[in-house]
Interface confidence: medium
């Protein structure tokens, strides 16, 4: 299953990055799971994961660093709390969980660049 | 003449970006000219230019936004005062001016990403 996501995104100076993950659904899925993975130096880490029923809101874990909304086959993902050391390739993985058959799609990744802000001068 | 430069550089939160421009000199040039060009939306603009004698410092114009140092066939370039809207492809152009023959090399460009910092809160 094909998954599309932008090649490059810049995090804001507040450490927030948003991108769209779009999948070409071969069937009429009602339950979809979206996972964001970070790949850097050949190491892959899960950033966050959410399950949603088509037409409903994404449900992330209770203290996820991601938020998101869904619209049809598009998922708008926002990652918060990013630091310069988090610069890397963020891969969108989409699973069509229900009804069968199960489908899996993995995007090529979005390179997210993060720059730490300069500290503000002390106010004396 | 081959010119190498990094594919991507992030400007610091102070709007400063540095990268190395390296050229494969076919001869023993004594006078070299380095020009930085910015390409965005198919429009090319000169950012700065410097001429230097091998073994000496680069001489930019006195109000140039660039500074740099040279070491052999490598030029270390720094561009200052960058804003988010300056994000673009920065191309290094190297000309071997003297002695003849004249050689020209153009790099593939360095994509410089710039994020404007958040304003600091007012100190009351």
């Amino acid at each position: 299953m094909h998954v599309a996501q932008p090649a490059v995104v810049l995090a804001s100076s507040r450490g927030i990055a948003s991108f769209v993950c779009e999948y070409a659904s071969p069937g009429k899925a009602t339950e979809v799971r979206v996972t964001v993975l970070r790949q850097a130096d050949s190491q892959v880490t899960e950033v966050c994961a959410a399950t949603y029923m088509m037409g409903n809101e994404l449900t992330f874990l209770d203290d996820s660093i991601c938020t998101g909304t869904s619209s049809g086959n598009q998922v708008n993902l926002t990652i918060q709390g990013l630091r310069a050391m988090d610069t890397g390739l963020y891969i969108c993985k989409v699973e069509l969980m229900y009804p069968p058959p199960y489908y899996l799609g993995i995007g090529n990744g979005t390179q997210i660049y993060v720059i730490d802000p300069e500290p503000c001068p002390d106010s004396d | 003449m081959h010119v190498a430069q990094p594919a991507v550089v992030l400007a610091s939160s102070r709007g400063i970006a540095s990268f190395v421009c390296e050229y494969a000199s076919p001869g023993k040039a004594t006078e070299v000219r380095v020009t930085v060009l910015r390409q965005a939306d198919s429009q090319v603009t000169e950012v700065c230019a410097a001429t230097y004698m091998m073994g000496n410092e680069l001489t930019f114009l006195d109000d140039s936004i660039c500074t740099g140092t040279s070491s052999g066939n490598q030029v270390n370039l720094t561009i200052q005062g960058l804003r988010a809207m300056d994000t673009g492809l920065y191309i290094c152009k190297v000309e071997l001016m003297y002695p003849p023959p004249y050689y020209l090399g153009i790099g593939n460009g360095t994509q410089i990403y710039v994020i404007d910092p958040e304003p600091c809160p007012d100190s009351d």
């Epitope: 190491q43 899960e46 966050c48 994961a49 874990l61 209770d62 203290d63 660093i65 709390g81 050391m85 | -």
Partner: nanobody, 126 residues
Framework: QVQLQESGGGSVQAGGSLKLSCAAS???????????MGWFRQTPGKERERVAT???????IYADSVKGRFTISKDNVKNTLYLQMNSLKPEDTAMYYC?????????????????WGQGTQVTVSS
């Protein structure tokens, strides 16, 4: 391989305090700094329950029963997770486990955590 080792458990009177520590090894600095970590507890015959978790950005979540009494903290230099337990009650008696996820985000479900310590016993008497 990631390994977690708890310490600091013991017996204490109700109203007393204990500080649990969990030393992590097998991590790169970056992976430790960004991994969700937490404390769970279990009493015989009951399911493991979340006590407190801390995610990559330092956001913490506590079980309702420990809010205001327990504090979770993470030392990214020493690669150590702590749980400061104050105003202990007899119902806090349990085996306390340190846990980690291969994720920046946490979960209340113990099954989502892939790495576990051996546990340290906390006993609170009235």
């Amino acid at each position: 391989q990631v390994q977690l080792q708890e310490s600091g458990g013991g017996s204490v009177q109700a109203g007393g305090s204990l500080k649990l520590s969990c030393a992590a090894s097998g991590y790169t600095d970056y992976t430790y700094n960004t991994s969700c970590m937490g404390w769970f507890r279990q009493t015989p015959g009951k399911e493991r329950e979340r006590v407190a978790t801390v995610n990559k950005v330092g956001s913490t979540i506590y079980a309702d029963s420990v809010k205001g009494r327990f504090t979770i903290s993470k030392d990214n230099v020493k690669n150590t997770l702590y749980l400061q337990m104050n105003s202990l009650k007899p119902e806090d008696t349990a085996m306390y486990y340190c846990a980690a996820r291969g994720s920046w985000s946490c979960s209340q479900f113990w099954g989502d955590f892939g790495y576990w310590g051996q546990g340290t016993q906390v006993t609170v008497s009235s």
